[in-house]
């Protein structure tokens, strides 16, 4: 049973390591894959002394933990590298951190990357 599924055809692309990896730094990535597999977008970033440093954004292969997620939200408490995934075109354009271990207000606002 699948409820209200969002198809993902393209994601925001960013690679902080673009020169070494010989890729573009930023752009829109078309998501390819087997026709029977779902596609997602992802974002990874670091928080260096309160400053957000994006590591990568792009397409993510079929992963059940990304199903039913329309927003890209990291909910893990104090990760070393932040990660989120989502379903829907360009859904990784904005990403946020809402640690669910805490019962108080979220510790940070949604982030819109400015490469």
């Amino acid at each position: 049973a699948i409820l209200g599924r969002s198809e993902t055809q393209e994601c925001l692309f960013f690679n902080a390591n673009w020169e070494k990896d010989r890729t573009n730094q930023t752009g829109v990535e078309p998501c390819y894959g087997d026709k029977d597999k779902r596609r997602h977008c992802f974002a990874t970033w670091k928080n260096i002394s309160g400053s957000i440093e994006i590591v990568k954004q792009g397409c993510w292969l079929d992963d059940i933990n990304c199903y039913d997620r329309t927003d890209c939200v990291e909910k893990k408490d104090s990760p070393e590298v932040y990660f989120c995934c989502c379903e829907g075109n360009m859904c990784n354009e904005k990403f946020s951190y809402f640690p669910e271990m805490e019962v108080t207000q979220p510790t940070s606002n949604p982030v819109t990357p400015k490469p």
Epitope: A1, I2, L3, G4, R5, G33, D34, D36, K37, R38, L61, D62, D63, I64, N65, C66, Y67, D68, R69, K75, K76, D77, F83, C85, E100, M101
Partner: antibody
Framework: EVQLLESGGGLVQPGGSLRLSCAAS????????MSWVRQAPGKGLEWVSG????????YYTDSVKGRFTVSRDNSRNTLYLQMNSLRAEDTAVYYC???????????WGQGTLVTVSS | QTVVTQEPSFSVSPGGTVTLTCGFN?????????PSWYQQTPGQAPRTLIY???TRSSGVPDRFSGSILGNKAALTITGAQADDESDYYC??????????FGGGTKLTVLG
């Protein structure tokens, strides 16, 4: 520490029903997909069912479709497997497993034995 | 229907190296199937060894490594020890919420 504790197994007659539960602790249950895996006596592991973080998407191996229903209660940190029209070939130890990103099973419960016999 | 194949049994001498493989009937195994490997001793729950093709789970010794060899996923154990004698299962994530387990390999450490 992550803990998964299955319960609800037991002896049931063919055609009968059982409801298995898996109580989760040590992690934020609502953030992760979950799965059921079984192992018949002396046999290998077999994936049975999976469920997404919200419970909005559910999946089954062909042999249990229409008979088993997986669900979750995120407010109670509990995973369920409702098993109806049980057959002798459903006899197995049933494990619940937490699913991590990259769709692998990172933590397993100790299992609960289901015996279907007349 | 997808069938995932493993060697039913394998033997290795203590200190030796063994490579277990995992293939399937519908083509080549690639990283997009997120191959993972699990160890199970009789009467125990499975233990996660390798995920996402080649990433070791926490606490797993570096004697265990995962890779893609040709068109199969592979688990290599170097410097085999007596307590490596177990059943080993590979799992492929087929996508769209479906996993398939291999039939398992029974590993015997000789001597």
């Amino acid at each position: 520490e992550v803990q998964l504790l299955e319960s609800g197994g037991g002896l049931v007659q063919p055609g009968g029903s059982l409801r298995l539960s898996c109580a989760a602790s040590g992690f934020t249950f609502r953030n992760y997909a979950m799965s059921w895996v079984r192992q018949a006596p002396g046999k290998g592991l077999e994936w049975v069912s999976g469920i997404s973080v919200t419970g909005g998407s559910t999946y089954y191996t062909d042999s249990v479709k229409g008979r088993f229903t997986v669900s979750r209660d995120n407010s109670r940190n509990t995973l369920y497997l409702q098993m109806n029209s049980l057959r002798a070939e459903d006899t197995a130890v049933y494990y619940c497993a937490k699913v991590y990103y990259s769709s692998f099973f990172d933590y397993w419960g100790q299992g609960t034995l289901v015996t279907v016999s007349s | 229907q997808t069938v995932v194949t493993q060697e039913p049994s394998f033997s290795v001498s203590p200190g030796g190296t063994v490579t277990l493989t995992c293939g399937f009937n519908s083509g080549s195994v690639s990283t997009s199937y997120y191959p993972s490997w699990y160890q199970q001793t009789p009467g125990q729950a499975p233990r996660t060894l390798i995920y996402n093709t080649n990433t070791r789970s926490s606490g797993v010794p570096d004697r265990f490594s995962g890779s893609i060899l040709g068109n199969k996923a592979a688990l290599t154990i170097t410097g085999a020890q007596a307590d490596d004698e177990s059943d080993y299962y590979c799992v492929l994530y087929m996508g769209s919420g479906i996993w398939v387990f291999g039939g398992g390999t029974k590993l015997t450490v000789l001597g």
